[in-house]
């Protein structure tokens, strides 16, 4: 696993890798918080779940997600964070066997139990933004990002490249 600063380095080094999306290039445990430093917490049972976006109590440990990094199998002409036209994608897992999924119909972010190979809905193109922030773009719906709406995670359509820096789709990854 590598630190946050290593994301950019690793992105640049992608062309050294022959892995093309079947297996992750690397995996990394990180806590996920919003641009405004609210924590993302996953309350997960067998048959139900809730995802909290809130200020965390001082004495509480932050939840972590397992980010698995993949190199996109399909070259992209879009200006992403890939190298040589390939893009860096991630899956996000808060606990064993569960992954975040994009439900484009409902514009919602969901948790689903599934086995590998994971469906496309579980993959997000990783964008490195300013101030050490990242954003997660749906593989299945370009231009749609994981974002925060009414203290919940939701899918948010970004109309233009200027809006890529809108705070509600920016997240921070931290090792602590």
């Amino acid at each position: 696993a590598f630190g946050i600063s290593g994301v950019q380095k690793y992105t640049r080094a992608l062309h050294d890798s022959s892995i093309t999306g079947i297996s992750p290039i690397t995996e990394y445990l990180a806590s996920l918080s919003t641009y405004n430093d609210q924590s993302i917490t996953f309350a997960l049972e067998d048959e139900s779940y809730e995802i909290y976006v809130e200020d965390l109590k001082k004495d509480e440990k932050k939840d972590k997600v397992l980010l698995s990094y993949y190199e996109s199998q399909h070259p992209s002409n879009e200006s992403g964070d890939g190298v040589d036209g390939k893009m860096l994608m991630v899956t996000l897992s808060p606990t064993k066997d569960f992954w975040l999924h994009a439900n484009n119909k409902e514009h919602s972010v969901e948790l689903h139990k599934c086995e590998k190979p994971l469906p496309d809905q579980a993959f997000f193109v990783l964008h490195n933004m300013h101030s050490n922030c990242v954003s997660f773009e749906c593989k299945t719906d370009p231009g749609v990002f994981i974002g925060v709406k009414d203290n919940h995670l939701a899918l948010i359509k970004v109309d233009s490249s200027e809006n890529l820096c809108t705070e509600n789709i920016l997240f921070k990854l931290s090792e602590t």
Epitope: D46, E60, D63, S93, K96
Partner: antibody
């Protein structure tokens, strides 16, 4: 439906040993941390011990450290508490409890006790 | 070791509001849970994460937590609410319970 069924309680002499079991059903057992909580007759609740979903991490109250051992067999969906060097003050109803939520990668004891068994009585007396 | 202090007993008339306090150092920096235990029965979680109610728990149960005190409030108390109530937090990878409060509905 989540079910937790304790067994193994009984009368034991001071210095003796006893092994409690908790059979779990209705949920993915290996995904949840589990705990033992006890209640002496007429007294309040006291947390005793906990174990992570994989069994790789264990936690104990100071009052039982070195004497009690918590373990689990995920293939049998069963939680255990091995109690050695028992004392009169260990007399209590012992409850098995499941964390409300599945363990996050960060681990540790963090969640409330969402489900409880019916308890098994342990009496330590000569 | 970390100590949570509850009043031993609280009395309330039917339909009135019962408030049970749970005091501990910097309590508001932790998430509090509350359990109800009726005679001869196992405890039941009634409040978690300070304010949240599990499904099946009536709306008359509510919680708050700030400073050094967490509070469980039972609004419109009913005879069936007569029970022992325990607060609980996690501290340094251990579970810590308060001593319990017996709620009597007069």
């Amino acid at each position: 439906e989540v079910q937790l069924l304790e067994s193994g309680g009984g009368l034991v002499q001071p210095g003796g040993s006893l092994r409690l079991s908790c059979a779990a059903s209705g949920f993915t057992f290996s995904s949840y941390a589990m705990s033992w909580v006890r209640q002496a007759p007429g007294k309040g609740l006291e947390w005793v011990s906990a174990i992570s979903g994989s069994g790789g991490s264990t936690y104990y109250a100071d009052s039982v450290k070195g004497r009690f051992t918590i373990s689990r067999d995920n293939s049998k969906n069963t939680l255990y508490l091995q109690m050695n060097s028992l004392r009169a003050e260990d007399t209590a109803v012992y409850y098995c409890a499941r964390d409300l939520w599945m363990e996050n990668w960060v681990g540790g004891l963090r969640y409330p006790f969402g489900y409880w068994g019916q308890g098994t009585m342990v009496t330590v007396s000569s | 070791s970390y100590v949570l202090t509850q009043p031993p007993s609280v009395s309330v008339s039917p339909g009135q509001t019962a408030s049970i306090t749970c005091s501990g150092e910097r309590m508001g920096d932790k998430y509090a849970a509350w359990y109800q235990q009726k005679p001869g029965q196992s405890p039941v979680l009634v409040i978690y994460r300070d304010t949240k109610r599990p499904s099946g728990i009536p709306e008359r149960f509510s919680g708050s937590n700030s400073g050094n005190t967490a509070t469980l409030t039972i609004s419109g108390t009913q005879a069936m609410d007569e029970a022992d109530y325990y607060c609980e937090v996690k501290k340094s990878d251990t579970g810590v319970f308060g001593g319990g409060t017996k709620v009597t509905v007069l």
